[in-house]
Interface confidence: medium
């Protein structure tokens, strides 16, 4: 039988009455246009909803928008359009919500053609009040907050000027012209690229990379011949044009661009691209596109300096620059990532790594599923996960995979069971151990969300017809209850719950349609009375993450340490609560050669864990330079994998070698850098 229909599924007592008392409907007095929703702050209960409706007239498009505010997690909304003087808000800029709990909101208004500049509405009290400010420029991008100080904003203008505000958008100053891309770094630093001649597009590959650490008082040119740049973790990356041809290479800096090293990565041609898939303070996953229009490339993982790279995964699906990749960080378990590869026969297969890209494997076939038509052997196949690529291809996949850091081990995703991703209608699968094992959770496509740190999972069927039923599970998707939240079905458009999965409220968004009218409507359901009591110590059980062989003393060791978590028992129906903190007990593992990667000039022969010196370095395609100048590379051939905490055990110490290596190219060397002040 389907999951949730088994005899042993116990029902949550009196849940219909409990949920009915906690279901709140709000009908918006709106024609159905588009709706966008933003949470303001963490655990504040404040939601802003912007509805926009375009009326196409003969000569122009007339727009109308309304702004609503809730301060009780969406149970009730108040029309606050008058606070923004009934102005039409530009949805393409969205609602710029300030970092952390700053309570700051910026809305960008539509202005008439001949105006000198744009207009914004600013709030610093969680949208209780707004101040109208006329800008001295027309914004090209949404206002960007400094992560360190929410009073500092930057924006690019339609004329490629870089504008900065130091008082939350009250006053603006143009600090540089001819700017292509600008990003906040750490410590209120701004990095940006500039063009000298024609335009951003014309000067691609001849841009300069600049830095200001004092909001535009002084500048330093930290790179030339730049194609693009990116920030990831503590790394600053720049792709730089080669001197002789049209290829470019990645350079990396860990000191905000003062010194650079060439990354040991292949160079790419005009039609290719680099992409930072994921980065933290330890390391980076980098995708390097294959030559030609193949739709795939190679994933490399870096060392702790971002310089030496190990090949992690071949034939990694990534369609084009800014295109689709299924690369997903499973945030509910350390070291786990899921992505797709394009196999030789052009089929797409899902791969998973549990050790931060060290090894990739197929996903284990769910126990309660049979192999589909893509499988050659009906008894041997894998689970394949639908993510961004499937969604872009308009498969019946309403949602990407979902995991939450505080819902330990839980991963929910659409998938199919076979030799490759299938075009057939997918089902929803769940893993409770970070992707090692999977179970079919729901039949057919669904929207899903995690509440109360995993204590409740909520789902709504992805249907062609209006819906009025929501499903929920209190045991990590094993058993499901259904609740009819309204007598009158609605055309469903989305599920909304507070980011962070700590809330017990879910909002169901949709619209009602009759012969003449069509209105937005939301239903907010509070599950607090389903989870009647607070969880106690007895409700939790000890769980060893990454456990595959309990007999092995090193069981659970990943990146040099193992972690035991306190996990809520599936049978416990109780509240983790908003203040729930994941309890984990780490213990250090003994080192093995697996905890080390091969340093520059060394490699691992196949089926061998030892690093062997490369016989020939001269003319090697992956040359690189340390700190932007000639350098004695001293190495014993091994470097500990970034983030690896192992101690004792194998210590691969051997004679330290000097690899005298001439820098053949370093376009970002210090002598090419300069400083200037405004």
């Amino acid at each position: 039988s389907a999951p949730g229909e088994d005899e042993e599924c116990g029902r949550v007592r009196d849940f219909v009455a409990k949920l009915a008392n906690n279901t709140h409907q709000h009908v918006f007095d709106d024609l159905r246009g588009s709706v966008s929703l933003s949470w303001v702050g963490d655990s504040t209960g404040v939601i802003l909803v912007l509805t926009t409706f375009h009326v196409p007239l003969v000569i122009m498009t007339f727009g109308q928008s309304k702004l609503y505010r809730s301060e009780d997690y969406g149970k009730n909304f108040k029309d606050i359009t008058d606070l923004i003087n009934n102005t039409f808000i530009r949805t393409e800029f969205g609602m710029a919500i300030g970092p952390e709990n700053s309570g700051k909101v910026v809305l960008t208004a539509e202005v008439s053609g001949g105006s000198r500049g744009g207009r914004i509405f600013r709030s610093s009290d969680f949208a209780k009040n707004f101040v109208q400010t006329d800008l001295p420029f027309h914004p090209l991008t949404q206002m960007m907050y400094s992560p360190q100080n929410s009073d500092y904003l930057l924006a690019l203008s339609t004329e490629n000027g870089l504008w900065v505000s130091k008082n939350f958008g009250g006053k603006w100053e143009e600090i540089h012209k001819a700017v292509c891309l600008a990003k906040w770094g750490s410590d209120n630093t701004i990095f940006f690229t500039t063009y000298a001649n024609g335009s951003c597009k014309a000067d691609l590959g001849a841009l300069e990379l600049w830095r200001t650490s004092d909001l535009g008082k002084s500048f330093k040119t930290i790179g030339v011949k730049i194609y693009s740049f990116g920030l990831g973790g503590r790394f600053l990356f720049a792709s730089v044009m080669a001197d002789k041809d049209t290829t470019r290479r990645i350079h990396v800096s860990t000191d905000q661009g003062d010194t650079w090293s060439m990354a040991q990565l292949p160079s790419v041609g005009q039609e290719q691209f680099y992409s930072i898939l994921a980065a933290n303070d330890d390391m980076v996953f980098m995708h390097v596109d294959e030559p030609g229009d193949t739709g795939f490339g190679t994933i490399f993982t870096s060392d702790d300096r971002g310089i030496v790279y190990s090949k992690s995964l071949d034939r990694h699906l990534y369609t084009t620059t800014g295109g689709e990749t299924d690369f997903t960080n499973v945030t509910s378990l350390r070291g786990v990532y899921i992505t797709s590869v394009l196999s030789e026969d052009n089929s797409i297969q899902t791969m998973i790594t549990f050790d931060q890209g060290g090894r990739w494997t197929h996903l284990r076939k769910p126990e309660n599923s049979e192999c589909d038509a893509t499988a050659k052997n009906k008894n041997e196949c894998s689970l394949h996960i639908h993510a961004s690529y499937s969604i872009s291809q308009k498969l019946n996949v309403p949602m990407a995979p979902l995991s939450e850091p505080n819902a330990v081990g839980i991963v929910i995703a659409h998938g199919s069971v076979g030799d490759a991703i299938s075009v057939m209608v997918p089902d929803v699968y769940i893993s409770d151990d970070g992707g090692y094992s999977w179970t079919k959770m729901l039949e057919g496509p669904h929207y899903y969300t995690i509440l109360d740190s995993g204590g409740i999972i909520v789902a709504i069927e992805h249907s062609s017809r209006p819906i009025n039923v929501i499903k929920f599970s209190t045991d990590e998707g094993q058993c499901w209850q259904t609740y009819t939240f309204t007598r009158d079905p609605i055309y469903f458009t989305g599920l909304a719950s507070e980011p962070g999965a700590r809330s017990m409220n879910i909002s169901i968004w949709g619209f009602t349609e009759s012969f003449l009218t069509s209105q937005w409507v939301s239903y907010t359901i509070d599950f607090k009375d389903i989870l009647e009591r607070n969880c106690e110590e007895k409700d939790y059980t000890i769980w060893l993450a990454h456990s595959t062989d309990p007999e092995d003393y090193e069981d659970g060791c990943i990146l040099g340490y193992k972690e035991q978590f306190l996990r809520l028992r599936k049978s416990s129906v109780c509240q983790n609560g908003r203040d729930y903190v994941v309890t984990k007990q780490p213990s250090i593992c003994l080192c093995s050669l697996e905890d080390f990667l091969c340093d520059f000039g060394y490699y691992r022969p196949e089926n061998d864990s030892k690093c062997v010196e490369q016989p020939e370095l001269k003319g090697h395609d992956l040359e690189f330079c340390l700190y932007g100048r000639e350098e004695h590379l001293t190495t014993n051939g091994y470097r500990k994998i970034p983030g690896d905490k192992c101690q004792g055990g194998v210590n691969p110490v051997r004679e330290v070698k000097d690899l005298k290596k001439k820098c053949t190219s370093n376009f970002l060397s210090p002598e090419k850098q300069n400083s200037k002040s405004n």
Epitope: A2, N346, N396, M424, V425, G444, R465, Y491
Partner: antibody, heavy 129, light 107 residues
């Protein structure tokens, strides 16, 4: 109007291959999958496989695995079905059929399985020595 | 694969009468089921999709019901043009499969 026009009848010898074309018009070719269905004389309908015109990915029924190849040419909005190693029991009318099969169409009420809503006129393939 | 079984194989009905056709799936296909009508020498024509939704241009006398494993196609008052073969088809799990068909003939 939306239509699928298939190539003409074919007579083939056992062991040979046949390639049937199906040209789509009246809608955005890449917005729908295409299924192939065959019907032997006096028999019921048999699904052979499906192709996604966007990426060209395919899924074939186990019975035809290794013998069937479905391809598409987006420049001419045409899908092709090639069946190799023909035998007498492959004598049938072959249909292409537009198949949403899970494509989320534009608009809110456009999800789920919509059935094969447009069919080609059929191509008769006779396998005889 | 999911096996679709239609019954009866032949149904003899007089014009104006009600016809009820049954389709059973070997496992749940949810509501991923379609019904087709086929007349001699013609391609099949979609009647019902999503188990119960009439396709564009299909008269109201055709209705579909059911979910999971049991499905029914009902023709409330048979017209002369309704005498044909009817097939059900699931699109729940690959490969798509059709039922063997029910021939509706004049009594």
């Amino acid at each position: 109007q939306v239509q699928l026009v298939q190539s003409g009848a074919e007579v083939k010898k056992p062991g040979a291959s046949v390639k049937v074309s199906c040209k789509a018009s009246g809608y955005t070719f890449t917005s729908r999958y295409m299924s192939w269905v065959r019907q032997a004389p006096g028999q019921g309908l048999e699904w052979m496989g499906i192709i996604n015109p966007v990426g060209g990915s395919t899924s074939y029924a186990q019975k035809f695995q290794g013998r069937v190849t479905m391809t598409r040419d987006t420049s001419t909005s045409t899908v092709y079905m090639e069946l190799s190693s023909l035998r007498s029991e492959d004598t049938a009318v072959y249909y292409c059929a537009r198949d949403p099969s899970g494509i989320a169409l534009a608009g809110p009420a456009s999800r789920g399985y919509y059935g094969m809503d447009v069919w080609g006129q059929g191509t008769t393939v006779t396998v005889s020595s | 694969e999911i096996v679709m079984t239609q019954s009866p194989a032949t149904l003899s009905v007089s014009p104006g009468e009600r016809a009820t056709l049954s389709c059973r799936a070997s496992q749940s296909v949810s509501s991923n089921l379609a019904w087709y009508q086929q007349k001699p020498g013609q391609a099949p024509r979609l009647l019902i999709y999503g188990a119960s939704t009439r396709a564009t241009g299909i008269p109201a006398r055709f209705s579909g019901s059911g979910s999971g494993t049991e499905f029914t196609l009902t023709i409330s008052s048979l017209q002369s043009e309704d005498f044909a073969v009817y097939y059900c088809q699931q699109a729940r799990l690959g490969p798509w499969t059709f039922g063997g068909g029910t021939k509706v003939e004049i009594k």
